[in-house]
Interface confidence: low
Amino acid sequence: RKIPKVGHTFFQKPESCPPVPGGSMKLDIGIINENQRVSMSRNIESRSTSPWNYTVTWDPNRYPSEVVQAQCRNLGCINAQGKEDISMNSVPIQQETLVVRRKHQGCSVSFQLEKVLVTVGCTCVTPVIHHVQ
Amino acid sequence: GITIPRNPGCPNSEDKNFPRTVMVNLNIHNRNTNTNPKRSSDYYNRSTSPWNLHRNEDPERYPSVIWEAKCRHLGCINADGNVDYHMNSVPIQQEILVLRREPPHCPNSFRLEKILVSVGCTCVTPIVHHVA
């Protein structure tokens, strides 16, 4: 069960805390570790037995505005001969991340945190076979 | 959501850039989606590059639990169920954004933090370096 929103906090917090209207929070979108870089193995999207392509989605009312999504190239997996083996399946691997969504309402703007599901890459799996009686 | 006034001159002045600090609604959209990869699929066991999932727990972060993938083998599982070392299991990594309480102990003040997580593993053909 989830408890619904409780309204204002009743507690005395440290004096240095910034004042915040009820029902909202202050969010600094200057990112910690902003310059960290992914050091994945080279070209794994092409070298994988379940290769994938990348598509960049862009939305100026989202922060970050660019989100990269992967799409598996094949239904099956690539075998040692470089051919597609449809006895195996290429499947997407997904991960949740947070974004900030900006919404315009007339002359006002509001901000909302949102969880988005990002497809990160693909992996090759043995299929689940359902036998029909 | 929480509304805050836009620039004077609205509606002509369209604010192209996000401000450094914003007030956001506490309610996260899509907050209740399933975050446990063990429950959402069994790919980690069925993959030819299987992985284990390790729970990374940090109560000063949202989400407080993140699952990290560690490839089980250097090689990949072949059709006979054996590890084939002619292929490599490698982690697929992704940068994600999380919330970090800042300043510490302030209940309604956060900063976005970028963290690198290994989400799963994939089987790749190795890069072979030939020594002259």
Epitope: K2, I3, K5, V6, G7, T9, G23, M25 | L26, I28, E57, P59, E60, R61, Y62, S64, L99, R101, P107, N108, F110
Partner: nanobody
Framework: EVQLVESGGGLVQPGGSLRLSCAAS????????MYWVRQAPGKGLEWVAE????????YYVDSVKGRFTISRDNAKNSLYLQMNSLRAEDTAVYYC????????????WGQGTLVTVSS
């Protein structure tokens, strides 16, 4: 699986005392702030008390300050609420809740224990 089980509620006369307990399992108890939340009949939820991970800081809603004491035993994965000088307006279902970093939300909470203050 995360579980929170409250106990210790009951009928008590005004001015009396009760001690509520909450047994926690399925998560690293010592890593989380814990809360007592109550819901009076026909009313909304009210955050009663918070205790930090190591028990060093406690916070209370004004109406219970000086009467209620929140405590925890991390070795036993247990949370407590000592309620003294009880008043009729303390009548409510009391819930134990595990804190998430996002304020005003709890990701897990128990089934509740009813406290009735009446003469």
């Amino acid at each position: 699986e995360v579980q929170l089980v409250e106990s210790g509620g009951g009928l008590v006369q005004p001015g009396g005392s009760l001690r509520l307990s909450c047994a926690a399992s399925g998560f690293t108890f010592s890593s989380y702030s814990m809360y007592w939340v109550r819901q009076a009949p026909g009313k909304g939820l009210e955050w009663v008390a918070e205790i930090k991970q190591d028990g060093s800081e406690q916070y209370y809603v004004d109406s219970v300050k000086g009467r209620f004491t929140i405590s925890r035993d991390n070795a036993k994965n247990s949370l407590y609420l000592q309620m003294n000088s009880l008043r009729a307006e303390d009548t409510a279902v009391y819930y134990c809740a595990k804190g998430e970093i996002l304020p005003l939300y709890f990701d897990y909470w128990g089934q509740g224990t009813l406290v009735t203050v009446s003469s």
